[in-house]
């Protein structure tokens, strides 16, 4: 391979998406960003939900959308499966609604493959322990 050949995968530079089981991505991401700095700007708005802990899969799910997994073997980035999206949405949408906000259209679960197969590769994500949602009023997540 010559130096002039474009690298297929790039290191993930967004710290909240490091150490999640894969470490390279390829832009554009699944919402159309070409630069990781643009992805980062939007990702930071989800920190309250991540810290609140509405879903143990939320961070992995968001990262799989904003910095999807890349592998040298496959030309297309690998994002989340629809099942993981639905699981996260089911647990986190009520928290967003408490704030007075809707589930983001950019995270519409119908955009993602229902399950991982040879035709539509996607990440199932880590298992989401089925514990009850916190009973604490989620108006100000992270408040002590």
């Amino acid at each position: 391979f010559g130096d002039e050949e474009e690298r297929r995968c790039d290191p993930i530079r967004i710290s909240m998406c490091q150490n999640l089981g894969y470490n390279v991505t390829k832009m554009p991401n699944l919402v159309g960003h070409e630069l990781q700095t643009d992805a980062e700007l939007q990702l930071t708005t989800f920190t309250p939900l991540i810290q609140y802990g509405c879903s143990s899969q939320l961070q992995f799910f968001l990262c799989s959308v904003y910095v999807p997994m890349c592998t040298e073997k496959i030309n297309i980035p690998i994002g989340p499966c629809g099942g993981m999206c639905l699981s996260v949405k089911r647990r986190c949408e009520p928290v967003l609604k408490e704030f007075g906000f809707a589930w983001p259209e950019s995270l519409n679960c119908s955009k993602f493959p229902p399950q991982n197969d040879h035709n539509h590769m996607c990440m199932e994500g880590p298992g989401d322990e089925e514990v009850p949602l916190p009973h604490k009023t989620p108006i100000q997540p992270g408040e002590e």
Partner: antibody, heavy 119, light 107 residues
């Protein structure tokens, strides 16, 4: 109740420095990115900088890069904007603003603090 | 940087009028657009997020829509308290950028 209160504005000579503070209450600063937006007299809104203290991200508008530094002290629940090498064109009301969770708009703003750069 | 070109820069209208303000992004910003209302000496207030979602507590006479890179804020029936300056904002690309504002004045 969520509140953002800015302070530290005032009159400063060109080339001088000023530090603005944004005291947050009603939520934990570590859970949110915080932004500074400014508005020159009679003009529109200009985004200045943001910090995500939880992840350590900062980002600046080109117009202030290298002169302004954004920081946060989560123990005091306060964000700061250190402004150095101030210019006449930095004269503005400076607002701190909190982004809506999981969305792309500012749902809470401070009342603003006026910075005047003049000799 | 992404340019958000807002028009008109000012308009005169009467109570009860339907008012439309437009913002055009210099390239696609998806639906990551918000609209704000600002009155003299006050901080801006969020009206619309994600191009078309009404923020909690905002009267239903305000609405937002998107067509490609064109974004529209509509006030269906202008009320006396709506005379103010309105700004659009994109949050798709860094840096965040605002439109130059539209001042809605009493005719």
């Amino acid at each position: 109740e969520v509140q953002l209160v800015e302070s530290g504005g005032g009159l400063v000579q060109p080339g001088g420095s000023l530090r603005l503070s944004c005291a947050a209450s009603g939520f934990n600063l570590s859970s949110y990115s915080m932004h500074w937006v400014r508005q020159a007299p009679g003009k529109g809104l200009e985004w200045v900088a943001y910090i995500s203290s939880y992840y350590g991200y900062t980002y600046y508008a080109d117009s202030v890069k290298g002169r302004f530094t954004i920081s946060a002290d989560t123990s005091k629940n306060t964000a700061y904007l250190q402004m150095n090498s101030l210019r006449a064109e930095d004269t503005a009301v400076y607002y701190c603003a909190r982004p809506a969770p999981g969305h792309w708009g500012f749902d809470y703003w401070g009342q603003g603090t006026l910075v005047t750069v003049s000799s | 940087d992404i340019q958000m070109t807002q028009s008109p820069s000012s308009l005169s209208a009467s109570v009860g009028d339907r008012v439309t303000i437009t913002c055009r992004a210099s390239q696609s910003v998806s639906s990551a657009v918000a609209w704000y209302q600002q009155k003299p000496g006050k901080a801006p207030k969020l009206l619309i997020y994600s191009a078309s979602s009404l923020y909690s507590g905002v009267p239903s006479r305000f609405s937002g829509s998107r067509s490609g890179t064109d974004f529209t804020l509509t006030i269906s029936s202008l009320q006396p308290e709506d005379f103010a300056t309105y700004y659009c904002q994109q949050w798709y690309y860094a840096p965040i950028t605002f439109g130059q504002g539209t001042k809605v004045e009493i005719k």
